[in-house]
């Protein structure tokens, strides 16, 4: 019970995770104007992974995509790639821990199976995880490093009178969702991978042992023992009645489908 | 058609107050940001603020700010501006103006003559 | 407070000549996220409220007629009517919408020569 328990939270949490990702990935509030000595703005100026948009007083947003490719700075790229990547492998990872959840039945699937997909996709959930929380770091450390450039060289003096303001950039909402859904899906990845060791069926294979008789010598060999874990894998002595009661183990809730001045 | 219809004339004593409305017409009302400028002696322009009539939410210049209230009724269309403490250079002539793109005020009321003698 | 500066304060212009007004403001207007710069120009003629000619320094709105244009960005930009017509006697006012609060030049009145 506590292992399925195990696996189907580690699966929830996983799930908000990555759509926490995907969220954060399709954001447009990466980084967003340092309002250091304007609270409130006439013209504020925020960036995304894929565009960038300004929002006026007026309350009209104006947004305009990176249309080039090879313009754009590496590390935006890599940020780009890291979090896709790990929502790639997140979709993975949810796919096929699916098929993996114990209170799903697929035909005649082996524990043994079950456990080594649930163990699959809590590697890849947490690879996902990190994917996204090193994405999301990378693009923090960027605004971090342009932020104090620009406020080295915040106002640069033309003619002695007139003052450029150079726009400084802070940590957008979507730093913040990326964290932690990367965390989320880091645990939920590391909840897949305990569930894994409670489902695999634990194989004790006794040494074969010799006796010496006085008389004649006779090899006693037991075969390998299945030892019976409370989450059998011997289905035979086991009835299963599609339409009646259920193991306790087997009555499980299936996961539910599912803007100034 | 746009329209911005404020209130008639106005004149107060000194330390009095005066709310001046601005009922809107001809488009969504909330869906524009409303200013309110003052001009006096017929020449100078000052912003006074902005009110988000979607939200209510409100900018004030410095120079106004403690003396201003903007407020909005959305079910009427209607911007409000007070002003409270009324001196005699608050005598002048105090227009509200619809906000569009680039933050240009599109569309002005006819304005309202707000007089504080001295 | 960004600060707004016209000249001339007053300008007498022949009908069918060009007219110029500069706007100068202490800072930039020109905003990076979308490379637009911040400036409106308005046209005041007596006992009548501003009316809106031109936004984001060189957009004109529509229904201004097209001898209104406007150019410049930064700090420093100009406003050209290109043959002066008899109804475009009036005041005209540059006023910085970027950063609050939002000022206004102190005008320029356009007189017939």
């Known amino acids: 019970m506590a292992v399925t328990a195990c696996q189907g939270l580690g699966f929830v949490v996983s799930l908000i995770g990555i759509a926490g990702i995907i969220a954060a990935t399709c954001m447009d509030q990466w980084s967003t104007q340092d309002l250091y000595n304007n609270p409130v703005t006439a013209v504020f100026n925020y960036q995304g992974l894929w565009r960038s948009c300004v929002r006026e007083s007026s309350g009209f947003t104006e947004c305009r995509g990176y249309f080039t490719l090879l313009g754009l700075p590496a590390m935006l790229q890599a940020v780009r790639a890291l979090m896709i990547v790990g929502i790639v492998l997140g979709a993975i990872g949810l796919l096929v821990s699916i098929f993996a959840l114990k209170c799903i039945r697929i035909g005649s699937m082996e524990d043994s199976a079950k456990a080594n997909m649930t163990l699959t996709s809590g590697i890849m959930f947490i690879v996902s995880g990190l994917c996204a929380i090193a994405g999301v770091s990378v693009f923090a450390n960027m605004l971090v490093t342009n932020f104090w450039m620009s406020t080295a060289n915040m106002y640069t003096g033309m003619g002695g009178m007139v003052q450029t303001v150079q726009t400084r950039y802070t940590f957008g909402a979507a730093l913040f969702v990326g964290w932690v859904a990367g965390g989320l899906t880091l645990i939920g990845g590391v909840m897949m991978c305990i569930a894994c060791r409670g489902l695999a069926p634990e194989e004790t294979n006794y040494k074969a042992v010799s006796y010496h008789a006085s008389g004649h010598s006779v090899a006693y060999k037991p075969g390998g023992f299945k030892a019976s874990t409370g989450f059998g894998s011997n289905t035979k002595n086991k009835k299963i009645y599609d339409g009646g009661a259920r193991t306790e183990d087997e009555v499980q809730s299936y996961p539910s489908k599912h803007d100034y001045v | 058609e746009v329209q911005l219809q404020q209130s008639g004339a106005e004149v107060k004593k000194p330390g009095a107050s005066v709310k001046v409305s601005c009922k809107a017409s001809?488009?969504?009302?909330?869906?524009?940001?409303m200013n309110w400028v003052k001009q006096s002696h017929g020449k100078n322009l000052e912003w006074i603020g902005l009110?988000?009539?979607?939200?209510?939410?409100?900018s004030y210049a410095q120079k106004f700010q403690g003396r201003v209230t903007m407020t909005r009724d959305k079910s009427s269309s209607t911007a409000y501006m007070e002003l409270l403490s009324l001196r005699s250079d608050d005598t002048a002539v105090y227009y509200c103006?619809?906000?569009?793109?680039?933050?240009?005020?599109?569309?002005w009321g006819a304005g309202t003559t707000v007089t504080v003698p001295s | 407070d960004i600060v707004m500066t016209q000249s001339p304060d007053s300008l007498a212009v022949s009908l069918g000549e060009r007219a110029t007004i500069n706007c100068k403001s202490s800072q930039s207007l020109l905003n990076s996220g979308n490379q637009k710069n911040y400036l409106t120009w308005y046209q005041q003629k007596p006992g009548q409220p501003p009316k809106l000619l031109i936004y984001?320094?060189?957009t004109r709105e529509s229904g201004v007629p097209d001898r209104f244009s406007g150019s410049g960005s930064g700090t420093d930009f100009t406003l050209t009517i290109s043959s002066l017509q008899a109804e475009d006697v009036a005041v005209y006012y540059c006023q910085n919408d970027y950063s609050y609060p939002l000022t206004f030049g102190a005008g320029t009145k356009l007189e017939l020569k």
């Open positions: 001809g488009y969504s009302f909330t869906g524009y940001t």
């Open positions: 984001w320094a060189s």
């Open positions: 103006a619809r906000m569009n793109y680039g933050n240009a005020m599109d569309y």
């Open positions: 009110i988000n009539p979607y939200n209510g939410g409100t």
